[in-house]
């Protein structure tokens, strides 16, 4: 009988390992080994036995040792296990960004590695062993489903082998893939809220908001705003899960009629859009035309307020009739209408949206200059002594200028109070002067001397 | 000067219906009208208008369901598909005023008709 | 859209009391809006206009006022014929998509 020792080896690739060959016989009429390996006996040996060793080992073999004794011939093997750890362990891709709430299949390959049996495929989360397989096929290929949570967000995942030979090998190998950090994501299934407004004028400057709710990592939540061909620049303000972004726009001439105001929220692979129409109107303030600004007394002006041909338009409280774009009304000029304002109020609806505009202007009546009676009496009669105050009133526009002398030298002190002396009496001539011309009026001016008994 | 509605009637769903809009003592070429209905137990629900220059704006929900149209004395409604939830009392209003001391228009349903009751039942 | 937001949606007074009635836009909408008030079977009756407006033929115990977003319709003096719903009406706009009215105030006089 032939004998092998040890009977079986497990020996890393590469590597050497020394086998004794016995007979059972003393004096074996041969005794060798049979292998494919590289061999080389180790001298001395015995009568009835021989030692080799096996070189580069490089996969499970098994050599045979063979004898021949008197009583026949016989062979025993040896069995080498070759060990050599995966010679690449590597996880698939993650998504670039994974939606929260739906599964994340994550799938590892393995190269090499012997002796499968002893090979065991983790895939792990941290340091948390989500899945353990063993290692089929060539190359092996490990998946696992895993749901994504707000939580899993920056977490990272590897794969990782295991090759353990204990008992027999008092160790156990491990290989790790390179991490990949998952990036998840939440965007709500509601589309943003829009605040703008519906109809905006040409030259002025409107607020957007756009906001969102329920997104996950805001941070990473990017907002485009525009109008239009116009893109605006938002500021955009985050908090704990939502966004809100403001911007200013201003509009011109060009984009006058129906726009779409577009607001987009983008986080991960997905897009939450939100549409709105908005109205770019052009609505100059209503003209007030008056046939001259400036017009002598009695004569006839025309009042005319012209607007937005869609408007409708007041003038000085009188509606068009029919309601309309253009009001207009005819007057004498009196002196009452000097420095009057005539107000044109129109009203132009923009898609439904009432928007207001007025101008008034003011008009300029010449007249005078004059001196009546009631502001300028003809005929005063003062007791001596007393304290009295003359008045004479000119009117006119422009005001008049008022000189009212006694014998073309003495001058009647107008507006001021005075102690009545025989001095003051007299006729006086008064005379009102201005661009349009002069009139005159004659005064009286009657001192009573006290009587004394 | 007065406004009243009249077409109302028990229709099945899916049969279109018209309800008319008459208007006496004013010009609809100077006024907006409102089409405004009430569900039984329910509150005042706006539906659309129509413009002095036939311009009409519907409620979104009303949009595709309802089309607004005048003649020179009528405003008409139509509900092109009525379903049961368009049972409801139909309103016809005008719907524009001028404000004298400012010189503006604005939007006010002044003047009401009575309604008209329409049913849709299978 | 002007959303017009009526709050309470129903109370109860009793006669010679007080009612107030609150309405929110939830926009800028000036002066321009009304209150309305209906009884059932009957078309809605226009109490105010332009915020504070008295309509012709209406009691003084019926106030408005505000401006801007927040409005107060104020009856003083309840009598049981002020039993009905009110409604706040947005006069500034009617473009596509627009909220017109108020949700409605039931006022029940006991």
């Known amino acids: 009988q032939t004998s092998v020792f040890p009977p079986e080896v497990i020996l890393p690739r590469g590597g050497s390992v020394k086998v004794n060959c016995s007979a059972s016989c003393d004096q074996p009429i041969s005794l060798g080994m049979e292998t494919p390996l590289p061999k080389k006996e180790i001298l001395p040996g015995g009568n009835n036995w021989k030692m080799y060793e096996l070189s580069n080992v490089q996969e499970d073999s098994q050599p045979m040792c063979y004898s021949n004794c008197p009583d026949g011939q016989s062979s025993a093997k040896t069995l080498l296990t070759v060990y050599w750890t995966p010679e690449r362990v590597e996880l698939a891709p993650l998504p670039p960004w994974q939606p929260v709430g739906k599964n994340l299949t994550l799938r590892c390959q393995v190269e090499g590695g012997a002796p499968r049996a002893n090979l065991t495929v983790m895939l792990l989360r941290g340091e948390k062993e989500l899945s353990r397989q063993s290692a089929v096929g060539e190359p092996a290929e490990v998946t696992t489903t895993v749901p994504v949570g707000r939580d899993d967000h920056g977490a990272n995942f590897s794969c990782r082998t295991e090759l353990d030979l204990r008992p027999y090998v008092l160790k156990l190998f491990e290989n790790t893939s390179a991490p990949h950090q998952l990036q998840t994501f939440d965007l709500p299934a509601t589309p943003p809220q829009l605040v703008s407004p519906q109809v905006l004028e040409v030259d002025t400057q409107g607020t957007v908001v756009c906001s969102l709710d329920g997104l996950f990592p805001v941070s990473e939540a990017q907002v485009s705003l525009a109008l239009g061909d116009q893109k605006l620049n938002p500021t955009i303000t985050y908090g704990n899960n939502s966004l809100s972004a403001k911007a200013s726009v201003k509009v011109t001439a060009e984009e006058e009629g129906t726009q779409q105001l577009l607001c987009g929220v983008m986080l991960g692979n997905q897009t939450q859009e939100t549409r709105q129409t908005v109205t770019i109107y052009s609505f100059p303030a209503p003209n007030v035309n008056l046939t001259k600004p400036e017009v002598s007394e009695g004569t006839e002006v025309i009042v005319e307020c012209e607007a937005h041909p869609r408007a409708k338009v007041m003038l000085n409280g009188v509606p068009a009739q029919p309601p309309g774009p253009r009001a207009q009304f005819l007057l004498k000029a009196t002196p009452e209408d000097n420095g009057r304002s005539f107000s044109c109020s129109a009203t132009l609806e923009v898609a439904g949206q009432l928007v207001h505009k007025n101008q008034t202007r003011e008009l300029r009546v010449l007249y005078g200059p004059r001196l009546d009676e009631k502001d300028c009496p003809g005929n005063w009669t003062w007791p001596e002594n007393s304290q009295q105050t003359p008045m004479c009133q000119a009117w006119g526009n422009p005001l008049p200028q008022l000189k009212c002398l006694k014998d073309g030298t003495f001058p009647l002190p107008i507006g001021q109070s005075v102690t009545v002396t025989r001095d003051l009496e007299g006729t006086y001539l008064c005379q009102a002067r201005s661009t349009r011309g002069e009139v005159t009026r004659e005064v009286t001016v009657n001192v009573l001397s006290p009587r004394y008994e | 000067q007065s406004v009243e509605e009249s077409g109302g009637r028990l229709v099945t769903p899916g049969t279109p219906l018209t309800l008319t809009c008459t208007a006496s003592?004013?010009?609809?070429?100077?006024?907006?009208m409102s089409w405004v209905r009430q569900a039984p137990g329910k509150g005042l629900e706006w539906i659309g208008i129509?413009?002095?220059?036939?311009n009409t704006y519907y409620a979104s929900w009303a949009k595709g369901r309802f089309t607004i149209s005048k003649t020179s004395t009528t405003v008409d409604l139509k509900i092109t598909s009525p379903t049961t939830e368009d049972t409801a009392t139909y309103f016809c209003?005008?719907?524009?005023?001028?404000?004298?001391?400012?010189?503006?228009?604005?939007?006010?349903?002044?003047?009401w008709g009575p309604g008209t009751l329409v049913t849709v039942s299978a | 859209a002007y959303d017009m937001t009526q709050t309470p949606a129903s109370m109860e007074v009793a006669v010679g009391g007080t009612v107030t009635i609150k309405c929110q836009a939830s926009?800028?909408?000036?002066?321009?809006l009304a209150w309305f008030q209906q009884k059932p079977g009957q078309p809605p009756k226009r109490l105010i206009y332009?915020?504070?407006t008295l309509a012709s033929g209406v009691p003084s115990r019926f106030k408005g006022s505000g401006s801007g977003t927040q409005f107060t319709l104020t009856i003083s003096g309840v009598q049981s014929d002020d039993a009905a719903t009110y409604y706040c009406?947005?006069?500034?706009?009617?473009?596509?998509?627009?909220?017109?009215f108020g949700g409605g105030t039931e006022v029940v006089v006991k």
């Open positions: 332009k915020a504070s």
């Open positions: 003592g004013f010009s609809l070429n100077n006024y907006y």
């Open positions: 209003a005008r719907d524009w005023s001028l404000d004298s001391s400012s010189g503006y228009y604005y939007y006010d349903m002044d003047l």
């Open positions: 129509i413009s002095d220059s036939d």
């Open positions: 009406q947005q006069g500034y706009s009617r473009s596509d998509g627009e909220h017109v």
């Open positions: 926009q800028n909408i000036h002066s321009w």
